[in-house]
């Protein structure tokens, strides 16, 4: 029968940037479709990404829905042509993912400075609160307001004419820093949660530098 | 378990440089900072600086500029301190901390370094 | 550069009795203060972070309060191994700076 060309599935990762997850496996199918399938640990099973020839599926909307749950997905592999037909134990083959908790394991994005201003001696510097895929009401939830005060910013700074670097944190979107009147600087941001063991941190932002655009400067 | 285990004692001549080691255990060595903490004989702590694993960013207090550098070797999850140039106010007891953003929340024996003609 | 300074340098008490330390912030840290204990030849160990949350496996009796510039730490009934060295460290913005800490004596 035509079963016994199927292969089940293998190496399920998960790959989740900001809440935007796809659930990715191997082979790539020979004479073979698959179906996703995913759940919480109570919930009963939903399918998603029908007899598809791709390796992956995106399952952002499932897991939005509560990010704080934790998910269980399986991929059923098929004949193609013959979907209906089974394996020998009467049922497609199918192999389950691990367990994923998008609000623990979720990695975070590349944050973005959106702005700075200096006023004296002083630099307000701005961190662009990302939109995600998470809803509420009806509307997109901010990174910010999906964690709160459990994510938290390091700011890198330095002066351009220098290598040497300073830093401070803040648990909102905005830094405000002292520095030395008539000298430029550079900003990096990254992207914290302290309360994690993994995942902990993005990648630094893009650096920003005062003199360029991004910036304003006001000599009170 | 979590655990920074440092280099032994070093008894040092003035002028000379010595590097402490910081091997760590237990975690995951790229999502945490390390902190470097000196104690001189009955004083307070102070901060040297840190290196975040993750990326290779190094902060230094302006004190310790020029006199200490820190490296890592992710393949060993150890991290290192060198320190130059040394006299006998460097004399002192050196602790890598665990940074975990809000805190300093584990640490190693320390290290005593002893800087003597 | 943030200044922490830490009060009292040294205070007696007895077993059983609360003492509080106190560390001022030459400016506004928010919550970003950490409490240490230290015993003799031996490393720090964390006790209280984010200005008022107590580490894992501290004991109920340590606490620590306050936000922006003063915070306090306390002790209520002193224990025989409460009798040691205890130092607050402002985590805001580098220079990561210590208070000059305050040793705790059995009267």
């Known amino acids: 029968s035509g079963t016994t060309n199927t292969v089940a599935a293998y190496n399920l990762t998960w790959k989740s940037t900001n809440f935007k997850t796809i659930l990715e496996w191997e082979p790539k199918p020979v004479n073979q479709v698959y179906t996703v399938q995913i759940s919480t640990k109570s919930g009963d099973w939903k399918s998603k990404c029908f007899y598809t020839t791709d390796t992956e599926c995106d399952l952002t909307d499932e897991i939005v829905k509560d990010v704080k749950q934790t998910y269980l997905a399986r991929v059923f592999s098929y004949p193609a042509g013959n979907v209906e037909s089974t394996g020998s134990a009467g049922e497609p083959l199918y192999e389950n993912s691990p367990e994923f908790t998008p609000y623990l394991e979720t990695n975070l994005g590349q944050p973005t400075i959106q702005s700075f201003e200096q006023v004296g001696t002083k630099v307000n510097v701005t961190v662009e609160d990302e939109r995600t895929l998470v809803r509420r009401n009806n509307t997109f939830l901010s990174l910010r307001d999906v964690f709160g005060k459990d994510l938290i910013y390091t700011l890198y700074y330095w002066k351009s004419s220098s290598s040497g670097k300073k830093t401070a944190k803040t648990n909102t979107n905005e830094f405000l820093i002292d520095v030395d009147k008539g000298e430029n600087y550079c900003f990096s941001v990254q992207a914290v949660i302290p309360s994690r063991t993994v995942n902990r941190k993005s990648t630094d932002s893009p650096v920003e530098c005062m003199g360029q655009e991004k910036g304003e400067f006001r000599e009170i | 378990e979590i655990q920074l285990q440092q280099s032994g004692p070093e008894l040092v001549k003035p002028g000379a440089s010595v590097q402490v080691s910081c091997k760590t255990s237990?975690?995951?060595?790229?999502?945490?900072?390390v902190y470097w903490v000196r104690q001189s004989h009955g004083k307070s702590l102070e901060w040297i600086g840190y290196i975040d694993p993750y990326n290779g960013i190094t902060i230094y207090d302006q004190n310790f500029k020029g006199k200490a550098t820190l490296t890592v070797d992710k393949s060993s999850t150890t991290a290192f301190m060198h320190l130059n140039s040394l006299t006998s106010d460097d004399s002192a007891v050196y602790f890598c901390a665990r940074d975990v953003t809000t805190a300093l929340d584990f640490w190693g024996q320390g290290t005593t370094l002893t800087v003597s003609s | 550069d943030i200044q922490m300074t830490q009060s009292p340098a040294s205070q007696s008490a007895s077993l059983g009795e609360s003492v509080t330390i106190t560390c001022l912030a030459s400016q506004t840290i928010d919550t970003w203060l950490a409490w240490y204990q230290q015993k003799p030849g031996k490393s720090p160990q964390l006790l209280i972070y984010?200005?008022?949350n107590l580490a894992d496996g501290v004991p109920s009796r340590f606490s620590g309060s306050g936000s922006g510039t003063k915070f306090s730490f306390k002790i209520s009934s002193l224990q025989a191994e409460d009798f040691v060295n205890y130092y607050c460290?402002?985590?805001?913005?580098?220079?990561?700076?210590f208070g000059a800490g305050t040793k705790l004596e059995l009267k």
């Open positions: 460290q402002q985590v805001y913005s580098s220079p990561f700076t």
């Open positions: 237990g975690y995951s060595f790229t999502d945490y900072n």
């Open positions: 984010a200005a008022t």
